[in-house]
Interface confidence: low
């Protein structure tokens, strides 16, 4: 049963945000119209992110199942580019609104996502 009729505008929701085994940070968002995913780096503990990060790979996924009526976009960045502690923001937005997810980033340590979003 579709939760959203095709063409109904919906604010992006971030479906997954993960650190992959190859060191990539990946963010997957769904919404209508198709969300844009932008990446930002915030030095230190500040969550005011201004330095834009160029994604290494972006694709629109074919979604035959949930979330119905939404377009799903996957974007990845290469974490090896970061040399300082800080936070990485994945921001998904479209004409309706925006949603962000954050990764804590510690140089030469593991990256783990915050388990909260900013809307």
């Amino acid at each position: 049963q579709p939760s959203v009729s095709p063409g109904e505008n919906t604010k992006p929701e971030i479906l997954t945000y993960d650190r992959l085994v190859n060191g990539m940070l990946q963010c997957v968002a769904a919404g209508f119209p198709e969300p844009t995913i932008d990446w930002y780096f915030c030095p230190g503990t500040e969550q005011r992110c201004s330095a834009s990060v160029l994604p290494v790979d972006v694709q629109t996924l074919n979604s035959s199942g949930p979330p119905f009526g939404k377009l799903v976009v996957q974007s990845s960045i290469d974490s090896s580019a970061f040399k300082h502690n800080g936070t990485v923001e994945c921001k998904a937005y479209n004409d309706v609104g925006k949603t962000s997810a954050y990764f804590n980033f510690a140089f030469k340590e593991q990256i783990h996502p915050h388990h909260h979003h900013h809307h």
């Epitope: 932008d38 834009s52 160029l54 290494v56 972006v58």
Partner: antibody, heavy 117, light 110 residues
Amino acid sequence: EVQLLESGGGLVQPGGSLRLSCAASGFTFSNYQMQWVRQAPGKGLEWVSSIRPSGGSTQYADSVKGRFTISRDNSKNTLYLQMNSLRAEDTAVYYCARGSSHAFDIWGQGTMVTVSS
Amino acid sequence: DIQMTQSPGTLSLSPGERATLSCRASQSFRSSYLAWYQQKPGQAPRLLIYDTSTRATGIPDRFSGSGSGTDFTLTISRLEPEDFAVYYCQQYGSSPPMYTFGQGTKLEIK
């Protein structure tokens, strides 16, 4: 140092074939979308083809669709462009470039392909 | 398909002057996917700006990008001798996936 180095260009007759290679170094090749872009003598840039990091999805400009095939070998850090049924209008410098849909951030120096009888 | 038109075709200016290069799309698109490149004779293109206004790594702050919808601008605030080159804008369209370059603007010394 991040680097892309094209090879395989040369002179070929119309209807002939050529295979271009692009050797990547200094970055994790298998993580990146890659593309071929060409530039005819004295003309502007024209996107030719793109391939996703895994190689599972490819895109082509209409002008080369059905004649050119992009591929990659992530174990060799190498990108390829197989060009068949070549035409005079395919004469150009062919660049490989790294990047995503946002932009192409690293380019090779190019390899010249001349199609002439 | 979206067409990208750059103007002027040639721009003649002197070092120290301000350069304004225009790129117009035949239809509106997502501004995240507008980039600018610089190309000098015999060299490969170099990425200057992506996402309409973000400078690529190592690009001096005299280069700036702006715009939205169909009209985009590359501005070089104070021309240096090494800035004289050809500049291309580039757009990405996702349906079908393809990349479109403008025809280029040649920035030459007056």
